[in-house]
Interface confidence: medium
């Protein structure tokens, strides 16, 4: 069976939305009215991976693009980056573990844990049009907190 | 004003010798970790040698390696370079650099001076 | 031994994006660094683990690796950003710390 999929945009607590800057990097930053028409809108894919009520392993790709979100190490640091793919073969439902996140929901809000990485995720600043990065903690100052917008395929 | 000056260079003919200092100022120099980084004439960048905080881990670059001793005096707030056996393709302006550590494989430069030029002639 | 290769020059009107490349078959695991140097002055850093950029650098400066490539993006480049820029990073082994060749940025 192929592997199901929803369109969505990010906002993180602070509503920031996330956008492209430059071929493979992502940014946080407030828009408002026209400008919301740049934020990022995800190819989110359920695939395989530990399940619970509450932590869903989803992929995070672009919709339309080859570019998936992926965790490498870089430096020995887990580092988060936008990883292109042949598109012919992805999204599928085994993904590579670089690619899988656990979706984790708690009081209405998202986390996005890397799976390769337990305890790191998905992150962004408190300032305003840095890059989307991931983080190894959580409840400090950057910020691990999302919300999801479905958007019609 | 955090910064950094080189002083120390000249002309000196090939086989000699030539001290380079660095006058940091503005930061806690012995919090750093201090490097070497040197440009040739119409040539790229080429790091050359690098100091632990404490002086007691030294590098070097193979091109340099056994000629060039790097050193810091914390109390002073400056850094070395003694460079014996000169060659003329160490003719290049040199530049101190310091190096923020944040383990093993993390070196970078993140505030360099304005650099003094050898000359090997 | 390790080398980190950009384009020589790359040339924009001012107010357009400029990009430059670094590629080096350690990228994919090594961060990328990237240095502005205008003759006669200090190198600045500009960019630091592939995409963070340090306080005081303009917003217009961004960076982004991915695979072998990293890429230092100027957005609305300015007749001050003229300078020669350098990518910096380590071989696979991270004991030899290297620089690309430079790529003089021109804005006309």
């Known amino acids: 069976a192929p592997v199901r999929s929803l369109n969505c945009t990010l906002r993180d607590s602070q509503q920031k939305s996330l956008v492209m800057s430059g071929p493979y990097e992502l940014k946080a930053l407030h828009l408002q009215g026209q400008d919301m028409e740049q934020q990022v809108v995800f190819s989110m894919s359920f695939v395989q991976g530990e399940e619970s009520n509450d932590k869903i392993p989803v992929a995070l790709g672009l919709k339309e693009k080859n570019l998936y979100l992926s965790c490498v190490l870089k430096d020995d640091k887990p580092t988060l980056q936008l990883e292109s793919v042949d598109p012919k073969n992805y999204p599928k439902k085994k993904m590579e573990k670089r690619f899988v996140f656990n979706k984790i929901e708690i009081n209405n809000k998202l986390e996005f844990e890397s799976a390769q990485f337990p305890n790191w995720y998905i992150s962004t600043s408190q300032a305003e049009n840095m890059p989307v990065f991931l983080g190894g903690t959580k409840g400090g100052q950057d910020i691990t907190d999302f919300t999801m917008q479905f958007v019609s395929s | 004003q955090v910064q950094l000056v080189e002083s120390g260079g000249g002309l000196v003919k090939p086989g000699g010798s030539l001290r380079l200092s660095c006058a940091a100022s503005g930061f806690t120099f012995s919090d750093y970790y201090m490097s070497w980084i040197r440009q040739a004439p119409g040539k790229g960048l080429e790091w050359v040698s690098y100091i632990r905080s404490s002086g007691s881990t030294i590098y070097y670059a193979d091109s340099v390696k056994g000629r060039f001793t790097i050193s810091r005096d914390n109390a002073k707030n400056s850094l070395y370079l003694q460079m014996n056996s000169l060659r003329a393709e160490d003719t290049a302006v040199y530049y101190c650099?310091?190096?923020?550590?944040?383990?093993?494989?993390?070196?970078?430069?993140?505030?360099w001076g304005r650099g003094t030029l050898v000359t090997v002639s | 031994s390790y080398e980190l290769t950009q384009p020589p020059s790359v040339s924009v009107s001012p107010g357009q994006t400029a990009r430059i490349t670094c590629s080096g078959d350690?990228?994919?695991?090594?961060?990328a660094y990237w240095y502005q140097h205008k003759s006669g002055q200090a190198p600045v850093l500009v960019i630091y683990?592939?995409?963070k950029r340090p306080s005081g650098i303009p917003e217009r400066f961004s960076g982004s690796s991915s695979g072998t490539m990293a890429t230092l993006t100027i957005s609305g480049a300015q007749v001050e950003d003229e300078a020669d820029y350098y990518c910096y990073s380590t071989d696979s082994s991270g004991n030899h710390r290297v620089f690309g060749g430079g790529t003089k940025l021109t804005v006309l």
């Open positions: 650099a310091r190096t923020p550590y944040s383990g093993r494989y993390h070196w970078y430069f993140d505030l």
């Open positions: 350690a990228l994919p695991i090594k961060y």
């Open positions: 683990e592939d995409s």
